[in-house]
Structures are given as structure tokens and as C-alpha cells.
């Protein structure tokens, strides 16, 4: 099959790092400077990505693979392949159109990115608040209020055993 395919399409023999050059009777030519082809059989080489401005180079371009970018300090990547850089905020803040804003009361953000999220509602799980939440940290839920009442035991005693053939008095 490979041989049949190569006879039909000479470009299929061109390896990564080359392109099938129509100007040279479809012979394989190495990619020109600052371009790449990451797979075989390509008819063109792609221009290398340039990591400029707020982007910085994480991996240099080669003739067989594109450059990879990340973001300069104070920014973080968004999108596939770090297509965008977004400004970091402090913990306890979120990024809005007007810049970094503190989380509203009842919400928190423990990262430098993302949005403020509501504190956990401990009562929904029948628990009480053990440690209060802050702008940077979620609340810590503890045992349920009933478990903390005086005289309450966390161990339920076993039910008394019944003797067979006796009805309860």
C-alpha cells in the first residue's frame, strides 16, 4: 500500500521538516528558515509562532515543531496552546473589566486567576461552620450542631437483643 500511495502522490514521501515543492517538480524541500512542518506529506511549511510582548518563549521553534509560548510573570495562559495571556490578580480578588477587584463578602478565590466563588453552605450538609471563610479561603465545615450539643454521644448504642419466642412487654 505504501508503495502504491507514493507512486500516486510523491508528496507522501516528504518527511516532517520538509514540504512538497511544486516549484521543483514536487520534490521534498527542507522548510525555509523560521518555518516548520510537524507531519509528513505537507505541501507548505507553516510560519513559526513568535512569542512577543506579554508572551515569552517556552520552547523554540524548529523545522519540525512550532514554538510554544507561555506568559510573562504577572500573567497566566488562557485558551488552547496559550493563545491569550490574562493578568494575574491576588488571592481574594477576581479580574473584571475594570481590573482586579476584591471578592464580595461571602465569596472567595484562593488562586491568582479565575472568579470569586461562594463559600460552602455548611448547613446544606447538616454541618456547622468550624472556621469562618475569608476572601482568600473557603469556610471549613465541622460536625453538625446536634453532634455538638451537651450529652450527645457520637456513638449510637446497639438496640437491646430480643429473645426468640418472647413478645415485647
Amino acid at each position: 500500500f505504501e508503495r502504491t500511495r507514493s507512486l500516486q502522490d510523491p508528496c507522501s514521501n516528504c518527511p516532517a521538516g520538509t514540504f512538497c515543492d511544486n516549484n521543483r517538480n514536487q520534490i521534498c524541500s527542507p522548510c525555509p528558515p523560521n518555518s516548520f512542518s510537524s507531519a509528513g506529506g505537507q505541501r507548505t511549511c507553516d510560519i513559526c509562532r513568535q512569542c512577543k510582548g506579554v508572551f515569552r518563549t517556552r520552547k523554540e521553534c524548529s523545522s519540525t515543531s512550532n514554538a510554544e509560548c507561555d506568559c510573562t510573570p504577572g500573567f497566566h495562559c488562557l485558551g488552547a496552546g496559550c493563545s491569550m495571556c490574562e493578568q494575574d490578580c491576588k488571592q481574594g480578588q477576581e479580574l473584571t473589566k475594570k481590573g482586579c477587584k476584591d471578592c464580595c463578602f461571602g465569596t472567595f478565590n484562593d488562586q491568582k486567576r479565575g472568579i470569586c466563588r461562594p463559600w460552602t453552605n455548611c448547613s446544606l450538609d447538616g454541618k456547622s461552620v468550624l472556621v469562618n471563610g475569608t476572601k482568600e479561603r473557603d469556610v471549613v465545615c465541622g460536625p453538625s450542631p446536634a453532634d455538638l450539643s451537651p450529652g450527645a454521644s457520637s456513638v449510637t448504642p446497639p438496640a437491646p437483643a430480643r429473645e426468640p419466642g418472647h413478645s415485647p412487654q
Epitope: 527542507p30 522548510c31 525555509p32 528558515p33 523560521n34 523554540e60 521553534c61 524548529s62 523545522s63
Partner: nanobody, 111 residues
Framework: AVQLVESGGGLVQPGGSLRLSCAVS????????MSWYRQAPGKQRELVAW???????HYADSAKGRFTISRDNTKKTLYLQMNSLKLEDTAVYYC?????WGPGTQVTVSS
């Protein structure tokens, strides 16, 4: 423009070795994509080995493990060391840089 002249071809038995040279004159040598091609009678010219623009050596499947491309920037010379030669390596071998081609050097593998 760049001028290229190959040498080192000849007649060799199967399993033998040859070292081809390509003398480069003209433009800056060290930064160029430099390649070795070959063309067997009645066949299309094929890429054998090359230095990419990132200065990494690459080889066609037919050359891997047997051929080695190298360069001497001070001598402005590109080399192709060919070991374990086979009958199917018989071809005219060409040096290439961009649009510039050498006249070629004949390599014949025959018993």
C-alpha cells in the same frame, strides 16, 4: 548567489563506503539550509540528508543509520559519509542550498 561543487563519487562494492564533499563559495555558509539529494536513472530527484535552518541534521528513511551529514564552516564544505552502501544507492548525488545546485557526482554501487 552560491556556487556548489560536489566531489568524492566513484565506483564501490556493496557494503563499501564513500565520503562526498560539497565545496561552497559565495554567500554565508553557516546559516544556510544545506541538503544532499540524489537522482537515480529514470527516477525523481529525492532528498537524502539535510541540515535544517535550526542546524539539526535530518535523514530520509533510506539514509538513516547508514549516512551521516556534516559540515565544516571554516572550510565552507558540506559532507555526506555513506556507509554500508547498497545497489539501490546508485545515483547522481547533488548538493543543494536554496535555489543553487551543484553539477552532481556519480556514485555507482556494483559488484
Amino acid at each position: 548567489a552560491v556556487q556548489l561543487v560536489e566531489s568524492g563519487g566513484g565506483l564501490v562494492q556493496p557494503g563499501g563506503s564513500l565520503r562526498l564533499s560539497c565545496a561552497v563559495s559565495g554567500n554565508i555558509f553557516s546559516i544556510r539550509v544545506m541538503s544532499w539529494y540524489r537522482q537515480a536513472p529514470g527516477k525523481q530527484r529525492e532528498l537524502v540528508a539535510w541540515f535544517a535552518w535550526d542546524n539539526i541534521a535530518h535523514y530520509a528513511d533510506s539514509a538513516k543509520g547508514r549516512f551521516t551529514i556534516s559540515r565544516d564552516n571554516t572550510k565552507k564544505t558540506l559532507y555526506l559519509q555513506m556507509n554500508s552502501l547498497k545497489l539501490e544507492d546508485t545515483a547522481v548525488y547533488y548538493c543543494n542550498s536554496g535555489d543553487s545546485w551543484g553539477p552532481g557526482t556519480q556514485v555507482t554501487v556494483s559488484s
